[in-house]
């Protein structure tokens, strides 16, 4: 056969579907690899061919489109399972070709089992809700194209294992689930089960997502530097180790590029000829506010180092702040035998 543009195994599309549910999988060629759509390809005389490699096998084989009740079918650029079976797991390839052109891509499909509480190895999308922000909604994802608009499915929402009904601040509204005022207690996995009829059969679509309640932009503030502060003086003798922590609180801000950094005499530590090390740690609150600590350390501080200006800086999408550490050289304690004795007139 003639050469084929092989896009390899597209691991971006690690498709996971539930066992015994319908699945519609679009050929990724038209979405991500080619600059034309299926209609254009079809009208240009190109044919879309599907085949697959079973899990733990090397042999490519054609997909059987003659199964009872058309369990697997193809419609335009979509491969349909009505429904899936566990042993449908494997790598699927769609190939677009005619006598002069050929292009193909493979993608992994995993058919996943779930338990009665919707627990499964499925990777769950995360939806962030702002805490105490007013009404916010989540929508049952990835159900478009499964049934025509004339069909009115029934939708049941669950939090974890429990059907959502008569919840205080969570209201099912068809494909949407409304949170009147999102609270930390609303964190968890939410499942919508969409039930619809087709050709005398009833199908179920199960979609689970994780809700994470995060800090609200209404409450977001510029970074707050807790340390260094005016109450702590770093008093050291030459030769001692100087350790100055910079601890900064950041409100949760979607996509904010948060940074903490030190300058010494207005320069990056790297631009100064002293042996400085900086270690960073990060912790998060339940609403994904962030606390970053950067500890500046000079192993053996000199009297010159103790005269320098050490400033901790922090920035987020809300603004920038800076705070200087109070560093001074420890005045040596008087030596009694010489200095105090002199005060008493000893010679």
């Amino acid at each position: 056969s003639e050469r084929c543009d092989d896009w390899g195994l597209d691991t971006m599309r690690q498709i996971q579907v539930f066992e015994d549910e319908p699945a519609r999988i679009k050929c990724p060629l038209f979405e991500h690899f080619l600059k034309f759509n299926y209609s254009t390809a079809h009208s240009a005389g190109l044919t879309l061919i599907w085949y697959w490699t079973r899990q733990d096998r090397d042999l490519e084989e054609p997909i059987n489109f003659r199964l009872p009740e058309n369990r697997i079918s193809k419609e335009k650029d979509v491969l349909w399972f009505r429904p899936t079976l566990l042993n449908d797991t494997g790598n699927y390839t769609c190939m677009l070709r005619n006598t002069t052109y050929c292009s193909k891509v493979a993608f992994p499909l995993e058919v996943v089992q779930k338990d009665s509480c919707f627990n499964s190895p499925m990777k769950l999308p995360v939806h962030k809700l702002y805490i105490e922000y007013g009404i916010q909604r989540i929508t049952c994802p990835n159900v478009d194209g499964y049934f025509p608009s004339s069909v009115k499915p029934t939708i049941t929402w669950y939090m974890g294992c429990y059907k959502i009904q008569n919840f205080n601040n969570v209201i099912p509204e068809g494909m949407n689930l409304s949170f009147l005022i999102a609270l930390i207690s609303n964190n968890g996995n939410y499942t919508c089960v969409v039930t619809y009829p087709e050709n005398g059969r009833t199908f179920h679509l199960t979609r689970t997502l994780t809700v994470k309640v995060v800090g609200s932009p209404k409450n977001a503030v510029p970074p707050v530097i807790h340390s260094p502060n005016d109450h702590v003086v770093y008093e050291k003798e030459p030769g001692e180790e100087l350790l100055i922590p910079c601890t900064v609180y950041f409100s949760f801000l979607m996509d904010s590029r948060n940074e903490v950094w030190w300058t010494i005499d207005g320069k990056k530590p790297d631009d100064i000829t002293i042996d400085v090390t900086i270690n960073e740690s990060i912790s998060h609150s339940r609403t994904e506010d962030e606390t970053r600590t950067q500890i500046l350390s000079i192993k053996k501080v000199t009297s010159e180092d103790l005269k320098r200006s050490y400033v901790c800086h922090a920035r987020s999408a809300k603004g920038e702040v800076a705070k200087a550490a109070k560093v001074k050289q420890k005045v040596p304690a008087p030596r009694y035998t010489v200095e105090l004795a002199c005060g008493f007139g000893a010679t």
């Epitope: 590029r257 903490v260 950094w261 990056k268 790297d270 960073e280 920035r315």
Partner: antibody, heavy 118, light 108 residues
């Protein structure tokens, strides 16, 4: 003298993989966040990935999320970019660059060319 | 995503003239987080201005930056022959970090 030297570019088929490296010298590598920025032929600059000083935090634009992985080895003063499921539109010169706090990309490498073509 | 739009696309000027390049953001950028770069053919970009108005190390003072919020400007007071190049603005207030599409300053 600060130096960033990229390597690992080349010709790869669509769907293939490539690993770029960036060797850093002349500065305290572990003090800087590091990024990869690419430039397609005749086009502008596009940020591709960033990694925090310690390597625990990574950031990507949607166009490469799931396909590209940035990593670093502070002991070897080296930055990496693992690129999988490569596409024709990933063809570009790839630069590594360093940043510190409010100082953006103050030093760049000379770039390494990645060509994705069958 | 913060989109940065540079204008004009091309600026045709003579050496000695003043160049004014604009960068407009689709949403507010904290001034400290806007930078300007110069790029010549076959070379890596070079940092000119950071924090909207601070001159990077080793950059001549004929380059200056100004602006805040959504509107930023790079000014070259008197163009030297070596200044003819492409200039990019860049923001890092929010991820993804984004660049403008570039302004080419060419010899008239």
């Amino acid at each position: 003298e600060v130096q960033l030297v990229e390597s690992g570019g080349g010709l790869v088929q669509p769907g293939g993989s490539l690993r770029l490296s960036c060797a850093a010298s002349g500065f305290t590598f572990s003090s800087y966040a590091m990024s990869w920025v690419r430039q397609a032929p005749g086009k502008g600059l596009v940020w591709v990935a960033e990694i925090s000083r310690g390597g625990s935090h990574t950031y990507y634009p949607d166009t490469v999320t799931g396909r590209f992985t940035i990593s670093r080895d502070n002991a070897k003063n080296t930055l990496y970019l693992q690129m999988n499921s490569l596409r024709a539109e990933d063809t570009a010169v790839y630069y590594c660059a360093r940043s510190y706090g409010n100082y953006p990309f103050d030093y760049w490498g000379q770039g390494t060319t990645v060509t994705v073509s069958s | 995503e913060i989109v940065l739009t540079q204008s004009p696309g091309t600026l045709s000027l003579s050496p000695g003239e003043r160049a004014t390049l604009s960068c407009r953001a689709s949403q507010s950028v904290i001034g400290s987080y806007l930078a300007w770069y110069q790029q010549k053919p076959g070379q890596a970009p070079r940092l000119l201005i950071y924090s909207a108005s601070k001159l990077a190390s080793g950059i001549p003072d004929r380059f200056s930056g100004s602006g805040s919020g959504t509107d930023f400007t790079l000014t070259i007071s008197r163009l030297e022959p070596e200044d003819f190049a492409v200039y990019y603005c860049q923001q890092d207030t929010r991820y993804p970090i984004t660049f403008g599409q570039g302004t080419k300053v060419e010899i008239k």
